[in-house]
């Protein structure tokens, strides 16, 4: 057991690291590092993660199990997967809402909040690309509703008042005077 | 509370032998490794000797390998010391400690009163 | 064998000082480093492990920093019980090796 950086251990299995004066067997997923082995190739003395904590990886150092994040309800994040012992709390937008992204370059661990998803049936459109990831990607209008502007104009019920091109194409009527 | 004793000092001629005890109380001695630490008279600390919680490892500084042995009984939470052609610089008082508390394997944390051990014709 | 070297060997203070004591050893040892206090007639006491960490029960006023070769006990407004003799030692390879000690004494 020399006192260089990185010695090699000659332990049967692998998993084994020189841990001070020793060559340890580390601690699994789930668990901290109370003490070091003391002997050689022995097993170091491993605790569970207290509850609220996780460590996702086998480890020869961790004398301390990382906190659990909790979800920002100020952002309307919702716990998608609770924290377990060898997992942070999973954290997400529940049904009908979709993740919005706070940093330009957004990966898994960027911070986000929650917006509705829009509904294209209060918009009297087609639904297009349903809501999960992003915002619902809304079509056409839906039968009896035809497009002015920006919105769906529900088609008219009689003979009267007007009913532009787009309308009587959709809708079926021609404009009466 | 956690305790070590020593005892079996004494003074013994050249070529003699001794052999040292250490009594633990407090703790659950077989779940922990001990060590023997001397210092001679006036002088500073040297580490003598390690044995593992179940004896099957144990080392030695070079200045006694040879002719120290370290031993344990878990059942009598007592560790011991075998000491053997006895030379005047083996002359200190050789205390018996572990570490009960800390996660750093080869610190002491807890340490006997010592035992005076005197090497002279 | 891993030699650890402490300057100085002694050093006189006075109570309400700073005294900083330090230590080197003769290879990389990461932080496996502990200090100890040691009081005429008595056992060392045990201060700090794992070059940093306070042992329980220890005054805050003593810290410990360093990591590798370099090591450091700083003492922060010393008490009329803190004059005693220092020890370093290393914990990374056999034999377990001290330091030749730092006695603190009444200036």
């Known amino acids: 057991q020399g006192g260089t950086r990185s010695p090699r251990c000659d332990c049967a299995g692998d998993f084994h690291k020189k841990i001070g004066l020793f060559c340890c067997r580390g601690c699994p997923a789930g668990h901290y590092l109370k003490a070091p082995c003391t002997e050689p190739c022995g097993n170091s003395t491993c605790l569970v993660c207290p509850q609220d904590t996780f460590l996702a990886w086998e480890n020869h150092h961790n004398s301390e199990c990382a906190r659990c994040q909790a979800c920002d309800e100020q952002a309307s994040q919702v716990a998608l997967e609770n924290c377990s012992a060898v997992a942070d709390t999973r954290c997400g937008c529940k049904p009908g809402w979709f993740v919005e992204c706070q940093v330009s370059q957004c990966v898994s661990s960027s911070p986000f909040y929650c917006q509705p998803c829009l509904d294209c049936g209060a918009l009297h459109r087609h639904t297009r690309l349903l809501c999960s990831r992003r915002d619902t990607d809304c079509g056409t209008c839906l039968p009896g509703f035809y497009e002015h502007g920006d919105g769906c104009v529900s088609c008219p019920t009689s003979t009267l008042g007007s009913c532009p091109e787009r309308c009587a194409a959709v809708c079926g009527w021609r404009q009466m005077f | 509370e956690v305790q070590l004793v020593e005892s079996g000092g004494g003074l013994v001629k050249p070529g003699g032998s001794l052999r040292l005890s250490c009594a633990a109380s407090g703790f659950t001695f077989s779940d922990y490794y001990m060590s023997w630490i001397r210092q001679a008279p006036g002088k500073g600390l040297e580490w003598v000797s390690y044995?593992?919680?179940?004896?099957?490892?144990?080392n030695y500084a070079d200045s006694v390998k040879g002719r120290f042995t370290i031993s344990r009984d878990n059942a009598k939470n007592s560790l011991y010391l075998q000491m053997n052609s006895l030379r005047a610089e083996d002359t200190a008082v050789y205390y018996c400690a572990s570490n009960v508390d800390t996660a750093m394997v080869g610190a002491f944390d807890i340490w006997g009163q010592g035992t005076l051990v005197t090497v002279s014709s | 064998d891993i030699e650890m070297t402490q300057s100085p060997s002694s050093v006189s203070a006075s109570v309400g000082d700073t005294v900083t004591i330090t230590c080197r050893a003769s290879?990389?040892?990461?932080?496996?480093l502990a200090w100890y206090q040691q009081k005429p007639g008595q056992a060392p006491k045990f201060l700090i492990y794992?070059?940093?960490n306070l042992q329980s029960g220890v005054p805050s006023r003593f810290s410990g920093s360093g990591y590798g070769t370099d090591f450091t006990l700083t003492i922060s407004g010393l008490q009329p019980e803190d004059f005693a003799t220092y020890y370093c030692q290393q914990a990374d390879s056999f034999p377990l090796t001290f330091g030749g000690g730092t006695k603190v004494d009444i200036k």
């Open positions: 794992t070059a940093s």
């Open positions: 044995i593992s919680s179940s004896s099957s490892y144990t």
């Open positions: 290879q990389h040892i990461s932080n496996w």
